[in-house]
């Protein structure tokens, strides 16, 4: 006898994807960066 | 709202095949978590399970009726359909369809009405 | 396949007083994903059955507080702690662990 399957044969995995802005000296314009899994 | 309804004949006579459909709102047969199954009741006895379809069409069967059951799916007429061979008056009962989502609640969470077939010549 | 036995098979009970239906399996319900798949489900007189309590313990949606289930591995209790008259009824254990899918043969709940 097999097990019931209760999984969907896949999963889907998310990223978080931050956005930050960040001042540079008295330049008021602002640098974004994207960060995807942890990694800039 | 989800909700299941069974559909079918309600007499058939022996050496028949017996064809039931499940009709399903609420919830598409094609969602990779759920899943539905046909379950049997005789008249004042348990429950029995009698085949089940996932949503890439895998089908599992009783062990004991396997080889007169048949399942499948229409997913756009949102549709699963029960073909059973070789009728006998044993096989009288109400007839349900149920579904599971899998993994939570891992249970059949929501049941049809079921329909009642009476095998008999 | 694995078989689920229930106990006791009928019980009359006292309306205000609790109530206990045990539910053995033949092997352990434990699945490969850690998760046990034992459910309880009510049938009430004329009616298709209801989902109750799924993966042992947990309370469907909609189902009063006063139905509890317990358990682990083979065994396994569904509780009512102040039976009231809509509890009347037909009530199963029944396993999603293993194939093919079984359930216990039905234990009685009636009032004295």
């Known amino acids: 006898d097999a097990e019931f399957r209760h999984d969907s044969g896949y999963e889907v995995h998310h990223q978080k994807l931050v956005f930050f802005a960040e001042d540079v000296g008295s330049n008021k314009g602002a640098i974004i960066g994207l960060m995807v899994g942890g990694v800039v | 709202q989800v909700t299941l309804k069974e559909s079918g004949p309600v007499l058939v006579k022996p050496t028949e095949t017996l064809t039931l459909t499940c009709t399903v709102s609420?919830?598409?047969?094609?969602?990779?978590?759920?899943?539905v199954s046909w379950i049997r009741q005789p008249p004042g006895k348990a429950l029995e399970w009698l085949a089940h379809?996932?949503?890439?069409?895998?089908?599992s069967y009783s062990t004991s009726l396997k080889s007169r059951l048949t399942i499948s799916k229409d997913t756009f007429k949102s549709q699963v359909v029960l073909t059973m061979t070789n009728m006998d008056p044993v096989d009288t009962a109400t007839y349900y369809c149920?579904?599971?989502?899998?993994?939570?609640?891992?249970?059949?969470?929501?049941w049809g009405q079921g329909t009642m077939v009476t095998v008999s010549s | 396949e694995i078989v689920m036995t229930q106990t006791p098979l009928s019980s009359p009970v006292t309306l205000g007083q609790p109530a206990s239906i045990s539910c053995r399996s033949s092997?352990?319900?434990?699945?490969?994903?850690?998760?046990?798949?034992l459910s309880w489900l009510q049938q009430r007189p004329g009616q298709p059955p209801r989902l109750l309590i799924y993966?042992?313990?947990n309370r469907f949606s909609g189902v009063p507080d006063r139905f509890s289930g317990s358990g682990a591995g083979t065994d396994f209790t569904l509780k009512i702690s102040r039976v009231e008259a809509e509890d009347v009824g037909v009530y199963y254990c029944?396993?999603?662990?293993?194939?093919?899918?079984?359930f216990g043969q039905g234990a009685r709940l009636e009032i004295k």
């Open positions: 149920a579904r599971i989502p899998l993994r939570s609640p891992g249970a059949f969470d929501i």
């Open positions: 379809i996932f949503s890439n069409d895998e089908k």
């Open positions: 609420g919830f598409s047969l094609s969602n990779a978590r759920m899943g």
């Open positions: 029944m396993q999603t662990t293993q194939l093919p899918l079984t």
């Open positions: 993966k042992i313990s």
């Open positions: 092997q352990s319900l434990v699945h490969s994903d850690r998760n046990t798949y």
